[in-house]
């Protein structure tokens, strides 16, 4: 069923990184507009992005209310200029999205190395605790706040003069590694949620190397 001159949305896809969550779909509208609704499995439908000609809708404000809930969205198609028109079943044409559970599925954003400090033969590497759009008590929570013990970081490090990489892991945002005296090292980090089956790892952070201004060197 559906209205004449409208086509149902298709390829509904969730695009989500660090809980910034956008629903995308096709096709680009021709003589039609879209409205999106979102709901939890047990909740009521809430309308967003009313009568839009876009093919995306930012649903972040809804999903951050409870990132552990499972959400479903649907996209309604209406004839442009006649949004009250309904199909033969008395309802506009719509298509359902796949289910989406932000906590289990949001992509982990590319991390950033905040700093590194060398003291003798040890280097402390600190990963920036990136802010998310998840709020509690009117403050934005960090990635570590939200994922807690489920989030680890992997550090890749190597001597500037060679290509052999070593790895270290931490369940905090800091690494303390042993290095050879007098050698410069490069670092890259990756966020990982080992318990996931999808989107387990972020992309690697930009590489930071000793001898550049981000770090600090103290010979003791």
């Amino acid at each position: 069923s559906g209205t004449t001159n409208t086509v149902a949305a298709y390829n509904l896809t969730w695009k989500s990184t660090n809980f910034k969550t956008i629903l995308e779909w096709e096709p680009k509208p021709v003589n039609q507009v879209y409205t999106v609704q979102i709901s939890t499995k047990s909740g009521d439908w809430k309308s967003k992005c009313f009568y839009t000609t876009d093919t995306e809708c930012d649903l972040t404000d809804e999903i951050v209310k409870d990132v552990k809930q499972t959400y479903l969205a649907r996209v309604f198609s209406y004839p442009a200029g006649n949004v009250e028109s309904t199909g033969s079943a008395g309802e506009p044409l719509y298509e359902n999205s796949p289910e989406f559970t932000p906590y289990l599925e949001t992509n982990l954003g590319q991390p950033t190395i905040q700093s590194f400090e060398q003291v003798g033969t040890k280097v402390n590497v600190t990963v920036e605790d990136e802010r998310t759009l998840v709020r509690r008590n009117n403050t934005f929570l960090s990635l570590r706040d939200v994922f807690g013990k489920d989030l680890i970081y992997t550090l890749y490090y190597w001597k500037s003069s060679s290509s052999g990489k070593k790895t270290a892991k931490t369940n905090t945002n800091e690494f303390l590694i042993d290095v050879d005296k007098g050698e410069n090292y490069c670092f890259s980090v990756q966020a990982v949620i080992p318990s996931r089956t999808v989107n387990r790892k972020s992309t690697d952070s930009p590489v930071e190397c000793m001898g550049q201004e981000k770090g600090e060197f103290r010979e003791i």
Epitope: T70, V134, L141, D145, V146, N171, S195, T197
Partner: antibody, heavy 121, light 109 residues
């Protein structure tokens, strides 16, 4: 509201296995770790392991590795803990628990009522 | 495996305050240990008061608070009531497993 309903008491012989169930309701089953904790008579609490139903990812206490298996059935929102090669010192109340999550917070919050497992010849 | 140590027993007067501590054999307790405090009264199941170091459950009275003091996790009880007499367990997270302390028996008298 969150509820964890455990299966009934069991009496087992040494060397046998026991499978305790924990049926969850009132929340999104896939997203929360379920912990298993036991308490022998007159003793303290002992962590056995945990399972994340959404991915079936598990972590076990080294003490029980090889003897404990945690599984889940997403169609019934039920988690299972199976302990094999039972001995008398496995006599205990077995609890499942779920964390309280509000933006962040990890550990134990909602508890099942406990299942008494008695191992006796 | 790490060992988590608590005072075996403590006594507090009605209306008084008391601090229960939780030490780790591996060094200082940090927020990455996600300290939990669990109360258990005789013949009852466990009830969590604090999780994630300092997060009270909606069922937890404001008379209880959790924090880190120096190198230990602590549970502070203000204005003790007779019904606070119970065993209190601390649990700490170590990268991939939880470890419970032996528990503190709190007497209110």
């Amino acid at each position: 509201q969150v509820q964890l309903q455990e299966s009934g008491a069991e009496v087992k012989k040494p060397g046998a296995s026991v499978k305790v169930s924990c049926k969850a309701s009132g929340y999104t089953f896939s997203s929360y770790w379920i912990e298993w904790v036991r308490q022998a008579p007159g003793q303290g609490l002992e962590w056995m392991g945990e399972i994340l139903p959404g991915s079936a990812s598990t972590k076990y206490n080294e003490k029980f590795k090889g003897r404990v298996t945690m599984t889940r059935d997403t169609s019934t929102s039920t988690v299972y803990m199976e302990l094999s090669s039972l001995r008398s010192e496995d006599t205990a109340v077995y609890y499942c628990a779920r964390d309280y999550y509000y933006g962040s917070s990890y550990g134990f919050a909602y508890w099942g009522q406990g299942t008494l497992v008695t191992v006796s010849s | 495996q790490a060992v988590v140590t608590q005072e075996p027993s403590l006594t507090v007067s009605p209306g008084g305050s008391v601090t229960l501590t939780c030490r780790s054999s591996t060094g200082a307790v940090t927020t990455s240990n996600y300290a939990n405090w669990i109360q258990q009264k005789p013949g009852q199941g466990p009830k969590t008061l604090i999780s994630g170091t300092n997060n009270r459950g909606p069922w937890t009275t404001a008379r209880f608070s959790g924090s880190i003091l120096g190198d230990k996790a602590v549970l502070t009880l203000w204005g003790a009531h007779a019904e606070d007499e119970a065993d209190y367990y601390c649990a700490l997270w170590y990268s991939n497993h939880w470890v419970f302390g032996g528990g503190t028996h709190l007497t209110v008298q």
